[in-house]
Structure formats: structure tokens, C-alpha cells
Interface confidence: low
């Protein structure tokens, strides 16, 4: 057999036995002659150095460049490859010799004690136990212990080769402490030497640098970088660092194993790089590489070295932030600086503290922005070493998509008396104000009653054929008033009104307001009835604990069977062709109420009394009447709002005043509450009595003292009282100057 590439000028050495494999018996003599074209050498098993005493290599007597290898009384251990080669070349001829020794079928190692096999617990890796055979066709199995297990070649991943040994997936014997090969010859068992199994790990799970990023120092400071490698068990790790200034004299490297919890399936290694006093040349990329032999993992971090501490705002720092109500707003403080600055946020000059709605840190986060968050936010950066300060102002503008105030107040099914003039209102609050408010309409019957147009509980108007109010053909005559602007509850609102000249047909009206961040709409069910009429006695909006009556009046000649109901909270599941308006269709959503009937000359009147009205009494009340002729049911709906009782409060303070004799004092005391409180004034804790100089106006809200005198000086108290209690504010009026003598004196 030939090894290597033939050269142009040299033929391969030629062996006297022209075979790849030679099988001879033990105790016989092995002799092979090798001839070539230049100086030759022999290599043989077990002793590659050529100093084996049993082996004799002699020059041939009959020619140059010829050597004969002779081994008398060969033994099984002489099995192996015999190689004749030209010195200092790759050109060689090889013959594999099996010395059949049935008493010792395995070739013993040099030490003849035991061998070591190193394995990794990798599913895909195989290991070779080098139990070579002196016989090529042995039946060899592998024994592993403890516990004892035997592995037999399976023609696949488990195999034995006399020239190589026993091959087996490494994980199969990773449990074992030792293994050996066993051959059966004529019912006799022969064993190879023992091989100790050493499980060697290789897997590195990760390499972590700490600090991992954003490392900044100034010249002269100490840099400490920790590199931690986490590995599987039975792993050894070599660390290697790469860094900018490799000739650093103050560099120190310490490697050590870290303790892990007992039973842990992992090992930890730590390498610490320390540079005592960094210079600008130490700035750059630091890379830590951990190697287990079979695997290398790296991690890098950039170290920035500054000449001295500093702080400045980054170029991306915003000056205007726009947001829509409800959004999460994030205003990052973008800065350049070392060390990281202390960051303090202020709103309109007042420091901001973090709470559940706002987080004031590197990033100012407002969880759900509201209008009151509008304003100027100042961020102040302070360098903790140099105390240098930098400030920047960010204006936050919060936009509000159109909100229609009446949307939550008006009943979705109010009814209107036939022929009356009605005004529908949409009060819109939006920032910026709406750039338009448009009105649309459509006939009530167009919006439903088609089986294919079934409505749903949460969207009672699935109609899409809205018409502009300019086109009121077939509907009610309409006029849209010019938008008004009003300050309502301290907010600038846009009020759009639609006047229906005569309520002739039932329709739906929709106002739609649009601004730059959104749209809002309100659908008004304008259900026109010729039927009964509802009035409230004594007041449109009763306060808690007051009594109120709902009067349902119907023409006796037209209607009968008047009944009061209250609209319940659980609507019907809507099926084909059903509509929530008119309410009459869904009587099962109504609760029948007790009422009192009496009559006048033309009408039947059904009165429903609410004694001591409570907030639970709020809701939609339905009066049902039946047409005497057609038996058709007519419904009228009225929404009842019960005002909550509120104890008196006085808005604004009375200010202490200093006034000169003869001047006038005018003060006002505005009180709110439900029921509305009575206002009284006191001077020095005594009721203030009106006279020519003391005037009380607007239900005692405004106090005027004309041509003040010295005796008007004192403590003035405004007190607002109702059944729910009193509220008061006080102020001291000082009167300066001398009292002029009057003629009377």
C-alpha cells in the first residue's frame, strides 16, 4: 500500500510482500524487505522511534537503498502498520500485519496498565476506545461499569475495527467509570486493558461582561472589568483579553473559579481586568474570550475615557412635545456627560416627584396625559463632581379630541311632542377647538325594521345613510345656528345648535365635531309623538331627598290604559328587525311602576310619585298609552336626573383690606351647594344689618360699604348655610385716616 503523492523523479519504495494486509501466526518470524531509489527508514507499531531491541533492521547485501525488517517470534502486540519511507519525504509504502495470537487478541498498550478515554456528553459525538485487535475478524463487545453494561456493534453508530478500536456514542458511556473490550474466541473470553472514562465538558453557556455597556471614566480613574463564563460541569476555561493599550503597566489580570450552589449543573469562572489609572489611550473596545478547547465565546464592551467631568444636552433634546389626551408621554433627557448627571424635572417652576401617574427620571413619563399636564417642563442636569448645571425647557401641548358634553347626559330615546319647535345642542370641548361641527339626519324608519338591518345592543343606530341637514326634504324643517363660544366649567367650549322649526317626523340627528387629533359624534334620537305628554312637578331636576312627581297627560278620547314604566338596565338580545326605539316594542325591558290616576275634563293624568328622590331613581321613565281605536301602543320617554346633595362651599377668599375713610369697599362671596345655600354677613360676629351705607345685593353675594367710617373697621365674615351645614370666610377691614367732624357734632 502506498502513502503520499509520487514525485516525478521518485518511485514509491517497493516491499517484498506485495499486500496491503498480511496475517501471520504468533511465534513465527516476520521479515519484509523494502527497496527504493534513495535512503530509506522503517516505522513499526508500538515503537515509532526505531530503538526496539526485538526488531532488527539490516542493509540488504545485494544492493543500495534496501533495508530488511526482521522480528523473530512475533507476538500479538506486533500487530499494526509497518511503514517504509524515504527520509524527509511523504513517500511511503505501508503493510498492515496481523499477528494472530488467540491467547492475546487485543494489542496491549505500552504501559500495559490502563488507558484513559476522554469524552464529552454530546449526543452527536462518538468516542473511540483504542482496543486494537491482532485478529481482524473478532466478535468484540464493550463492557462498561458500574453498573455493568455491555454494548455490541449494531452496524450503525456502535462498531469495532481491529485497526482503530471500539467506536460508540460518547453519551452512552458517560455514566461509566471504566470500560474495556472483550472478545469471544472458542467460548473463551479475552479482555483488553481497562480504560478510565473521563467526562470532559466543553459547552460554554455564556460570557458576561460587567459592567456590560456604557462604561465611562475620566483620566486617572480605576477601570475594573469582570468577565464571567458560565459552563457545563467538567470544563476548564482559558480567558483571553483584548484591549486598546496592551502595553499597560498598571494592568492586572486575576482568574478564578467561582463557587456555585451544590447540585448546580453549571460552573462559573471569573476573570477580572483592572487598570489602576486609565489614560485617554485606554479608550476603546475591550473583549473577553473564554475558551474550553472545543468552544470559544466572546463578549465586548466599549470603554470611554474623558479628559474631565462634563455635562451637556444632546442634539436630539426636544423643545416641543405634542400629545393627545390619554396617551403615554415620554420626554427623554438626552445628555452627554460624565459621570451621569443628576436629573431634576420641574413643571412651571415646581419640582416634580414620581408617583403612580408620573415618573420623573432619565425619561419624564406621564402615564396617561391629561389637559392639566400642559405646560413648560424644565429639566436641570447637574454634574455630580463639578456641580456644573445645564437646563432645558420642553413645552408640552396636550390635544383633546372633540368631546360632546351632552353625550353622557341626554337619554338616547327622548320623545318630542308633535308640532313643537325644538332645539338640539352639541357642546363640544376640544383642543385645538373643532375646525368644524357638522349636522346630519335621517328618518327613524330608514334606520331599521329591515331584517337585514338588525341592530345590536351596543350600537342602536346601524344606519349609514346620513344626509346633510341642508337637505331636509322629507324631514323636519331645520336651521343650524352659528357656533357660539362659551366658558363652561372653566373651559372654552364650542356650542352648536340645531333648531327644528316643527317636530313633524321621527328622525335621528347626528352632530360631528372634528379637530386635528380626532372626531366626536353624538346621535340624538328625535322621536316625535302625538301621544301622551310628560311633565315634572315641581322641578325639572330634583335634588336628593326632595319629592318629585312625573305627570303623564293623555287625551281621554284618543288614549286609554295609561301605564308608567322605568327603563331597565338589561336590554333584550336583539333579533331580526328589532329596534330599541320606540321603547314600546320591548316591554320586557321595562319595570312597571305604581301610579295614581285622575281625570280632568279632557285628559286622563297618571301621576307617579317619587318621595325622597335618590340617585338610584335617575333614569328613563316611560309612559305608555294605547290608542282606543287601533290599539297601537304609544310611548313617551323622559330622562330624570336627580341632583346630588352637596354641602355649601365658598369659592375664592375674602382679602384683608386697608381703606381710607370716605372711600367705598366692595366684596363678593360666591357660594355653591345643593340645595343652594343662604348667604349671611357678620361684622365682629354680629349679624350685619343693611342701612344707608351698607348694601347687600344678588342674594347677599355682594357687600358694598359706602363712604366708610372708622367704626366700619373690624372682622367681616361671609357665611353660607344649607341643611347640609355651613361654610364661612373671613377678612379684616382696616380703616385709615382721621374722622372728619360733621356739622352735627
Amino acid at each position: 500500500a502506498s502513502v503520499g503523492l509520487p514525485s516525478v523523479s521518485l518511485d514509491l519504495p517497493r516491499l517484498s510482500i506485495q499486500k496491503d494486509i498480511l496475517t501471520i501466526k504468533a511465534n513465527t518470524t516476520l521479515q519484509i524487505t523494502c527497496r527504493g531509489q534513495r535512503d530509506l527508514d522503517w516505522l513499526w507499531p508500538n515503537n515509532q522511534s526505531g530503538s526496539e531491541q526485538r526488531v532488527e533492521v539490516t542493509e540488504c547485501s545485494d544492493g543500495l537503498f534496501c533495508k530488511t525488517l526482521t522480528i523473530p517470534k512475533v507476538i500479538g502486540n506486533d500487530t499494526g502498520a509497518y511503514k517504509c519511507f524515504y527520509r524527509e519525504t511523504d513517500l511511503a509504502s505501508v503493510i498492515y500485519v496481523y499477528v494472530q495470537d488467540y491467547r492475546s487478541p487485543f494489542i496491549a498498550s505500552v504501559s500495559d496498565q490502563h488507558g484513559v478515554v476522554y469524552i464529552t456528553e454530546n449526543k452527536n459525538k462518538t468516542v473511540v476506545i483504542p482496543c486494537l485487535g491482532s485478529i481482524s475478524n473478532l466478535n468484540v463487545s464493550l463492557c462498561a461499569r458500574y453498573p455493568e453494561k455491555r454494548f455490541v456493534p449494531d452496524g450503525n453508530r456502535i462498531s469495532w475495527d481491529s485497526k482503530k478500536g471500539f467506536t460508540i456514542p460518547s453519551y452512552m458511556i458517560s455514566y461509566a467509570g471504566m470500560v474495556f473490550c472483550e472478545a469471544k474466541i472458542n467460548d473463551e473470553s479475552y479482555q483488553s486493558i481497562m480504560y478510565i472514562v473521563v467526562v470532559v465538558g466543553y459547552r460554554i453557556y455564556d460570557v458576561v461582561l460587567s459592567p456590560s455597556h456604557g462604561i465611562e471614566l475620566s483620566v486617572g480613574e480605576k477601570l475594573v472589568l469582570n468577565c464571567t463564563a458560565r459552563t457545563e460541569l467538567n470544563v476548564g476555561i482559558d480567558f483571553n483579553w483584548e484591549y486598546p493599550s496592551s502595553k499597560h503597566q498598571h494592568k492586572k489580570l486575576v482568574n478564578r473559579d467561582l463557587k456555585t450552589q451544590s447540585g448546580s449543573e453549571m460552573k462559573k469562572f471569573l476573570s477580572t481586568l483592572t487598570i489602576d489609572g486609565v489614560t485617554r489611550s485606554d479608550q476603546g473596545l475591550y473583549t473577553c474570550a473564554a475558551s474550553s478547547g472545543l468552544m470559544t465565546k466572546k463578549n465586548s464592551t466599549f470603554v470611554r475615557v474623558h479628559e474631565k467631568p462634563f455635562v451637556a444636552f444632546g442634539s436630539g433634546m426636544e423643545s416641543l412635545v405634542e400629545a393627545t389626551v390619554g396617551e403615554r408621554v415620554r420626554i427623554p433627557a438626552k445628555y452627554l456627560g460624565y459621570p451621569p448627571p443628576e436629573i431634576k424635572w420641574y413643571k412651571n417652576g415646581i419640582p416634580l416627584e414620581s408617583n403612580h401617574t408620573i415618573k420623573a427620571g432619565h425619561v419624564l413619563t406621564i402615564m396617561e396625559v391629561s389637559e392639566r399636564d400642559t405646560g413648560n417642563y424644565t429639566v436641570i442636569l447637574t454634574n455630580p463632581i463639578s456641580k456644573e448645571k445645564q437646563s432645558h425647557v420642553v413645552s408640552l401641548v396636550v390635544y383633546v379630541p372633540p368631546q360632546i358634553g351632552e353625550k353622557s347626559l341626554i337619554s338616547p330615546v327622548d320623545s318630542y311632542q308633535y308640532g313643537t319647535t325644538q332645539t338640539l345642542t352639541c357642546t363640544v370641548y376640544a383642543i385645538p377647538p373643532p375646525h368644524h361641527i357638522h349636522w346630519y339626519w335621517q328618518l327613524e324608519e330608514e334606520c331599521a325594521n329591515e331584517p337585514s338591518q338588525a341592530v345590536s345592543v351596543t350600537n342602536p343606530y346601524p344606519c349609514e345613510e346620513w344626509r346633510s341637514v341642508e337637505d331636509f326634504q322629507g324631514g323636519n324643517k331645520i336651521e343650524v345656528n352659528k357656533n357660539q363660544f362659551a366658558l363652561i366649567e372653566g373651559k372654552n367650549k364650542t356650542v352648536s345648535t340645531l333648531v327644528i322649526q316643527a317636530a313633524n317626523v321621527s328622525a335621528l340627528y347626528k352632530c360631528e365635531a372634528v379637530n386635528k387629533v380626532g372626531r366626536g359624534e353624538r346621535v340624538i334620537s328625535f322621536h316625535v309623538t302625538r301621544g301622551p305628554e310628560i311633565t315634572l312637578q315641581p322641578d325639572m331636576q330634583p335634588t336628593e331627598q326632595e319629592s318629585v312627581s312625573l305627570w303623564c297627560t293623555a287625551d281621554r278620547s284618543t288614549f286609554e290604559n295609561l301605564t308608567w314604566y322605568k327603563l331597565g338596565p338589561q336590554p333584550l338580545p336583539i333579533h331580526v328587525g328589532e329596534l330599541p326605539t320606540p321603547v314600546c316594542k320591548n316591554l320586557d325591558t321595562l319595570w312597571k311602576l305604581n301610579a295614581t290616576m285622575f281625570s280632568n275634563s279632557t285628559n286622563d293624568i297618571l301621576i307617579m310619585e317619587l318621595k325622597n328622590a335618590s340617585l338610584q331613581d335617575q333614569g328613563d321613565y316611560v309612559c305608555l298609552a294605547q290608542d282606543r281605536k287601533t290599539k297601537k301602543r304609544h310611548c313617551v320617554v323622559r330622562q330624570l336626573t336627580v341632583l346630588e346633595r352637596v354641602a355649601p362651599t365658598i369659592t375664592g377668599n375674602l382679602e384683608n383690606q386697608t381703606t381710607s375713610i370716605g372711600e367705598s369697599i366692595e366684596v363678593s362671596c360666591t357660594a355653591s351647594g345643593n340645595p343652594p345655600p343662604q348667604i349671611m354677613w357678620f361684622k365682629d360676629n354680629e349679624t350685619l344689618v343693611e342701612d344707608s351705607g351698607i348694601v347687600l345685593k344678588d342674594g347677599n353675594r355682594n357687600l358694598t360699604i359706602r363712604r366708610v367710617r372708622k367704626e366700619d373697621e373690624g372682622l367681616y365674615t361671609c357665611q353660607a348655610c344649607s341643611v347640609l351645614g355651613c361654610a364661612k370666610v373671613e377678612a379684616f377691614f382696616i380703616i385709615e385716616g382721621a374722622q372728619e367732624k360733621t356739622n352735627l357734632e
Partner: antibody, heavy 113, light 111 residues
Framework: EVQLVESGGGLVKPGGSLRLSCAAS????????MNWVRQAPGKGLEWVSS????????YYADSLKGRFTISRDNAKNSLYLQMNSLRAEDTAVYYC??????WGQGTLVTVSS | QSALTQPRSVSASPGQSVTISCTGT?????????VSWYQQHPGKAPKLMIY???NRPSGVSNRFSGSKSGNTASLSISGLQAEDEADYYC???????????FGGGTKLTVL
């Protein structure tokens, strides 16, 4: 044209679970109440469950409460029925219906060991 | 046991008329004008024929009509045709805990 297509039926062992889906098209899904109705082999129609357009109002047949859950995803125009602890008597063709005016072709659920 | 009672089967010859009844209580058929009728051919999905007692969806022949008296609703089919052979189910809104209830179904055979 209104189209309702059920899917998710199949063979399941007693005690097992299935999730039926109904893909809707050809109408404004988010405006309509939706229903599941079933029909056991050779038997009549049995109302199973209803859900309003915004999922605010949900109703189940008394015999199924606690085992079946109806839900919908208006963004995906889809109706669902999650069926747990299935029994042999739940074997049926399950129909999805829009307000009982439009029906799908049904999906067969077989509960058998 | 269905809450609404229907005859199991009815039959008539082509051209004749037939009426299918659906009996409930004051909590369902008698209490609400929400009675519907469905036609179902074998292997097919049900089809709405009548809603709210007597209303016909577009596309349904005027040979089909619905009515109600007290607690009983009726479906009438005039001028019977072979394609009318099918199962017919009634349903009603009900004020019990389940809002919908079906009848047991009636098999209509056209002789």
C-alpha cells in the same frame, strides 16, 4: 352578500375541548348580535348562545353554562365558541347565525371515545 | 323536550295549503311578537322564512305567511310545491333565563 363560514369541528374524546370559529363577511359584523345554534344528528335545532355586537350582553342555554364560552373579535370579523368538558350529547352540527336571519353551513362536532 | 310544541309531521298534496302550529306560553309566544319560522332541507342550514310573527324577509315567496293567536303561532303555506318539502322550526323570544327557544320541528311531506 352575507357569508358565515364555521370551522374547528372534528372528533374529540369525552372531557376534551374544541374551539369553533365563524368567519363573517359581506356585512358590518360589529353592528350585529351573533348566535350559535346546534343540531344533533336527526334532531331539532337547539339554541346554544348569543353575544351582542360589543360583547356587553352574553346569554347561554342553561344546560351548557360553565362549559361553553362565546366570544367575538370585531377587528377580525370572527365569532368563537370555546367548548370544554365535552360530552357525547354535545355531538351535533354547530351553526353560527347572524340574528337568526343568516346562517352558516355548520361544522360537525363528534364527541366519542 | 323543546319548550315550543310543534306537530312532528304534516303532509299535503301539491297545490294544497297546509298550516303548522307552534304552541308556547305567555312567557314566550303569547307574551312577545318575536316569533320566527325557519325552513331546513336535509343537509342544509336553516333559512329564515318569517320574523316577528308575520313579516317576510325579501326573497321569500308570498305563499308563506305567519300569524299568532294567544299562545299559539302558525305558519301557513299555500299552493304547496315539491320544493317546500322540508323541516320547519319555530322560535320565540322568551323571558326565561335563556332568551331564545326553538320548537321541536315539523316534517312537511308533499305527497
Amino acid at each position: 352578500e352575507v357569508q358565515l363560514v364555521e370551522s374547528g369541528g372534528g372528533l374529540v374524546k369525552p372531557g376534551g375541548s374544541l374551539r369553533l370559529s365563524c368567519a363573517a363577511s359581506g356585512f358590518t359584523f360589529s353592528s350585529y348580535s351573533m348566535n350559535w345554534v346546534r343540531q344533533a344528528p336527526g334532531k331539532g335545532l337547539e339554541w346554544v348562545s348569543s353575544i351582542s355586537s360589543g360583547s356587553s350582553y352574553i346569554y347561554y342555554a342553561d344546560s351548557l353554562k360553565g362549559r361553553f364560552t362565546i366570544s367575538r373579535d370585531n377587528a377580525k370579523n370572527s365569532l368563537y365558541l370555546q367548548m370544554n368538558s365535552l360530552r357525547a350529547e354535545d355531538t351535533a352540527v354547530y351553526y353560527c347565525a347572524r340574528d337568526f336571519g343568516n346562517w352558516g353551513q355548520g361544522t360537525l362536532v363528534t364527541v366519542s371515545s | 323536550q323543546s319548550a315550543l310544541t310543534q306537530p312532528r309531521s304534516v303532509s299535503a298534496s301539491p297545490g294544497q295549503s297546509v298550516t303548522i302550529s307552534c304552541t308556547g306560553t305567555s312567557s314566550d309566544v303569547g307574551g312577545y311578537d318575536y316569533v320566527s319560522w325557519y325552513q331546513q332541507h336535509p343537509g342544509k342550514a336553516p333559512k329564515l322564512m318569517i320574523y316577528e310573527v308575520s313579516n317576510r324577509p325579501s326573497g321569500v315567496s308570498n305563499r308563506f305567511s305567519g300569524s299568532k293567536s294567544g299562545n299559539t303561532a302558525s305558519l301557513s303555506i299555500s299552493g304547496l310545491q315539491a320544493e317546500d318539502e322540508a323541516d320547519y322550526y319555530c322560535s320565540s323570544y322568551t323571558s326565561t333565563s335563556s332568551p331564545v327557544v326553538f320548537g321541536g320541528g315539523t316534517k312537511l311531506t308533499v305527497l
